[in-house]
């Protein structure tokens, strides 16, 4: 039934970039400026997204595809299709309601976005701290005591990564 109906429906012949104009006997008309249709058989064209303010145009709108936005320098995208722009912070900081704040002692953030995370707790694996953590970098754990014993093999597989946890300094 669907196939029969589509054969009889003149709008199904309208390609992407056009719409089926009911005001003109269902003739396929090109999408007007600043609008698009990404699929065939459309009865209307969609309005192009406009990248304004903190948004900037990553890809211009065409008759068959919407514009794509990203964020101006100092901001990064959030949400599907970059629906929001959020302020960048420096490494070693996180964004709060009051702006960018330094990571608390025992936490780090090695990116310009996201939250401060706790340092890895080396002692959970029976390891000691090889390199201390900073606001910008996680702790680095040394090898386990078993790796250092006289009978240790020369090559050990990498230890599995664990969830970061507090590391006493």
């Amino acid at each position: 039934f669907e196939r029969t109906r589509s054969l009889q429906d003149p709008c199904s012949n309208c390609p992407a970039g056009t719409f089926c104009d009911n005001n003109r006997n269902q003739i396929c008309s090109p999408c007007p400026p600043n609008s698009f249709s990404s699929a065939g058989g459309q009865r209307t064209c969609d309005i192009c997204r406009q990248c304004k303010g903190v948004f900037r145009t990553r890809k211009e709108c065409s008759s068959t595809s919407n514009a794509e936005c990203d964020c101006t320098p100092g901001f990064h995208c959030l949400g599907a299709g970059c629906s929001m722009c959020e302020q960048d912070c420096k490494q070693g900081q996180e964004l709060t309601k009051k702006g960018c704040k330094d990571c608390c002692f025992g936490t780090f953030n090695d990116q310009k976005r996201g939250i401060c995370r706790p340092w890895t707790n080396c002692s959970l694996d029976g390891k000691s701290v090889l390199v201390n953590g900073t606001k910008e970098r996680d702790v680095v754990c040394g090898p386990s005591p078993a790796d250092l014993s006289p009978g240790a093999s020369s090559v050990t597989p990498p230890a599995p990564a664990r969830e970061p946890g507090h590391s006493p300094q």
């Epitope: 390891k127 996680d138 680095v140 090898p143 790796d147 050990t156 990498p158 990564a161 664990r162």
Partner: nanobody, 115 residues
Framework: AVQLVESGGGLVQPGGSVRLSCAAS????????VAWYRQAPGKPRELVAV???????RYADSVKGRFTISRDNAKNTVYLQMNSLKPEDTAVYYC?????????WGQGTQVTVSS
């Protein structure tokens, strides 16, 4: 995963110098801290020197002023320059690459200090 290969060991006279290299596969090597450990026969491995991803260094008291650790991230290599060598520096030297709680060893290179 990053793999580490040491080279540069050998026989050297007391008071001499040698430079060990720890070459890594993998483009994320620059984010790893790298340490040199050494192991003499029948003894546990001991930390010799460590360099963080930012280049901060730390040394065992027994090698301070004689050994220098450095890194060339463009070459994915960490070096251990060993000067004024003593017979007690004789050991197998191992490279250890670490990031958070993950760690990888090299296979080791023998350094023998003897006249």
């Amino acid at each position: 995963a990053v793999q580490l290969v040491e080279s540069g060991g050998g026989l050297v006279q007391p008071g001499g110098s040698v430079r060990l290299s720890c070459a890594a596969s993998g483009s994320i090597f620059s984010s790893y801290a790298v340490a040199w450990y050494r192991q003499a026969p029948g003894k546990p491995r001991e930390l010799v020197a460590v360099i963080s991803s930012e280049g901060t260094t730390r040394y065992a008291d027994s090698v301070k002023g004689r050994f220098t650790i450095s890194r060339d991230n463009a070459k994915n290599t960490v070096y251990l320059q060993m000067n004024s060598l003593k017979p007690e520096d004789t050991a197998v030297y191992y490279c250890f690459g670490g990031r958070s709680s993950m760690g990888t060893w090299g296979q080791g290179t023998q350094v023998t200090v003897s006249s």
